[in-house]
Interface confidence: low
């Protein structure tokens, strides 16, 4: 069986200051079981954005049906962007664990640059 | 299977504003997705007006954004729009459709209502 | 905004023939490109997806391909009820925008 891959389609977005961002992913298989997290940033000092599993991210929401059983889809949309905004998304799978889950694969990542605000 | 239904007064004064409903069956707008508006005037082509998330999270087109104002109910399961000002260039048939374009793959719209006409005249 | 522009405006076309349809970007859209199928007096109905994937329920017949800035939609052997208007639509870059329509009428 094909091992999960995480597709980020778009190597970037670009998003006026002020409006909404779409970060798309998804995977190739529903295995390993386990959920998905959004960081900005890779490494120790990165920023978790959104957990499946957990959490309250009043200005992310998911443009799917995640609780759907076949879900692969596990695209992303944040509101109210600004230049804070800026940086390199990774949508990333983690597998199952006890007592903790396990980070098991990285998509390649989506930098979102904000534009000025339109006049 | 999902079904949309739009409604509303088919006839506007210029200036005033228009008012439109999409009620949704068959599925829940808090489960996911976007939902659209889109247009066509008379005899032309298609215009997207801008989309909704069930959280409010808008996205609109740019040439109508300063009177546009779309809206959710999700207790009604209906989403809704607003466009001030009007005047007989908004005279068009109003669809309202679900947005499955924000996703990965990218479908597009794929389920519409019937459409509905407003008129924009005095 | 992108501009979708398609040709011909209107295809003639004898029952049983291949059609073919053109569907150009004024920029790229990656394959983030659908193409819809609009009969008189009803709502436009989603045909193909990603550029090539045919929407649940769509005849084989229909076909997408194309990536960037050109698309093509084939209809290998026109059926009466396919005489129709067929719109593309970016969705890659916002606003999300139509072609001005392809008209296929019968010859």
């Known amino acids: 069986e094909d091992e999960l891959q995480v597709i980020q389609p778009e190597k970037s977005v670009s998003v006026a200051a002020g409006e909404s961002a779409t970060l798309r992913c998804a995977m190739t298989s529903l295995i390993p079981v386990g959920p998905i997290m959004w960081f900005r940033g890779a490494g120790a000092g990165r920023e978790l954005i959104y957990n499946q599993k957990e959490g309250h991210f009043p200005r992310v929401t998911t443009v799917s049906e995640l609780t759907k059983r076949n879900n692969l889809d596990f695209s992303i949309s944040i509101s109210n962007i600004t230049p804070a905004d800026a940086g390199t998304y990774y949508c990333v799978k983690f597998r199952k664990g006890s007592p903790d889950d396990v980070e098991f694969k990285s998509g390649a990542g989506t930098e979102l640059s904000v534009r000025a605000k339109p006049s | 299977q999902v079904q949309l239904q739009e409604s509303g007064p088919g006839l506007v004064k210029p200036s005033e504003t228009l008012s439109l409903t999409c009620a949704v069956s068959?599925?829940?707008?808090?489960?996911?997705?976007?939902w659209a508006w889109i247009r066509q005037p008379p005899g032309k082509g298609l215009e997207w007006i801008g989309s909704?998330?069930?959280?409010?999270?808008?996205y609109y087109n740019p040439s109508l954004k300063s009177r546009v104002t779309i809206s959710v109910d999700t207790s009604k399961n209906q989403f809704s729009l607003k466009l001030s000002s009007v005047t007989a260039a908004d005279t068009a048939v109003y669809y309202c459709?679900?947005?499955?374009?924000?996703?990965?793959?990218?479908?597009?719209?794929?389920?519409w209502g019937q459409g509905t006409t407003v008129t924009v005249s005095s | 905004e992108i501009v979708m522009t398609q040709s011909p405006a209107t295809l003639s076309v004898s029952p049983g023939e291949r059609a073919t349809l053109s569907c150009r970007a004024s920029?790229?859209?990656?394959?983030?490109l659908a193409w819809y199928q609009q009969k008189p007096g009803q709502a436009p109905r989603l045909l193909i997806y990603?550029?090539?994937t045919r929407a649940t329920g769509i005849p084989a017949r229909f076909s997408g391909s194309g990536s960037g800035t050109e698309f093509t939609l084939t209809i290998s052997s026109l059926q009466s009820e396919d005489f129709a208007v067929y719109y593309c639509?970016?969705?890659?870059?916002?606003?999300?925008?139509f072609g001005g329509g392809t008209k296929v009428e019968i010859k």
């Open positions: 990603g550029a090539s």
């Open positions: 068959g599925y829940s707008i808090s489960s996911g997705y976007y």
């Open positions: 920029q790229s859209v990656s394959s983030n």
């Open positions: 459709a679900r947005d499955r374009s924000r996703g990965y793959p990218v479908y597009g719209m794929d389920v």
């Open positions: 639509q970016q969705l890659n870059i916002h606003p999300w925008t």
């Open positions: 909704i998330y069930h959280s409010g999270s808008t």
